[in-house]
């Protein structure tokens, strides 16, 4: 995922509407001019701002990586929402890339949770019911998992 960054400031194009700040702040979908006197609209599909703010530049829209699907496009008030493709997932502690879900559980374990865009399949020990740590198993059973149906975005929104 492309990191949030400042969109380069350009001369105000005709379509970029100006308005006056309220209490020194500009509404979502706008940024403030350097002198603090004007609110300038973000450019649809290019940059955005989600809150009342005094940013000198709107934030650059995220572009979904290959291996991701775009759940919703970037608007002037909300960043793009990207999600891992079916059969892959993104963990909170490694949000930079989608990883392939395991196709099955190690011997002696059973699957209790499907692959979703935000989690790998979940395996527990048959007897104790304790969870597997999540490392790729050395030997896998033939039991395969079907990818979970995407329900909500696992990646960033504004």
């Amino acid at each position: 995922i492309t990191q949030q960054d400042l969109a380069p400031q350009q001369r105000v194009a005709p379509q970029q509407k100006r308005s006056s700040p309220s209490e020194g702040l500009c509404p979502p979908g706008h940024h403030i001019s350097e002198d603090g006197r004007d609110c300038i609209s973000c450019k649809y599909g290019q940059d955005y701002s989600t809150h009342w703010n005094d940013l000198l530049f709107c934030l650059r829209c995220t572009r979904c990586d290959s291996g991701e699907v775009e759940l919703s496009p970037c608007t002037t008030t909300r960043n793009t929402v990207c999600q891992c493709e079916e059969g892959t997932f993104r963990e909170e502690d490694s949000p930079e890339m989608c990883r392939k879900c395991r196709t099955g559980c190690p011997r002696g374990m059973v699957k209790v949770g499907d692959c979703t865009p935000w989690s790998d399949i979940e395996c527990v020990h048959k007897e104790s019911g304790t969870k597997h740590s999540g490392e790729a198993p050395a030997v896998e059973e033939t039991v395969t998992s079907s990818p979970g149906t995407p329900a909500s975005p696992c990646s960033l929104s504004g």
């Epitope: 700040p21 020194g24 702040l25 002198d35 009342w52 703010n53 005094d54 940013l55 000198l56």
Partner: nanobody
């Protein structure tokens, strides 16, 4: 890319003082207001103070009013937080923040920020 670097944290006795600095590199602070938040062990991040770099208007959380003073030196691209009469409950990691975010224009307390420093630890203990 906006980068914020805090310094000045350390161990101080109750009643003592510290001055924190926040320097911006790259494309300055990226916003007109710059603020300080803090996060005490096991607690959420809370707003401390903010300053408007254009006109010097300042904002403070009730818990630090009269004890902390925020200031700026635009020529050095730096914002300072002078902390006096420090108390044990001021112990926290202090974060410099820019691109402060508000739910409403009339709000004095931001709900978050776009840009954050790495934080500097302030410990108030005897």
């Amino acid at each position: 890319e906006v980068q914020l670097l805090e310094s000045g944290g350390g161990l101080v006795q109750p009643g003592g003082s510290l001055r924190l600095s926040c320097a911006a590199s790259g494309r300055t602070f990226g916003s007109i207001r710059v603020g300080w938040f803090r996060q005490a062990p096991g607690k959420g991040r809370e707003f401390v103070s903010a300053i408007n770099r254009n006109d010097g208007t300042t904002y403070y959380a009730d818990s630090v009013k009269g004890r902390f003073t925020i200031s700026r030196d635009n020529s050095k691209n730096t914002v300072y937080l002078q902390m006096n009469s420090l108390r044990p409950e001021d112990t926290a990691v202090y974060y410099c923040a820019a691109g402060l975010q508000y739910n409403r224009s009339a709000d004095r307390v931001p709900v978050g920020a776009v840009y954050w420093g790495q934080g500097t630890l302030v410990t108030v203990s005897s």
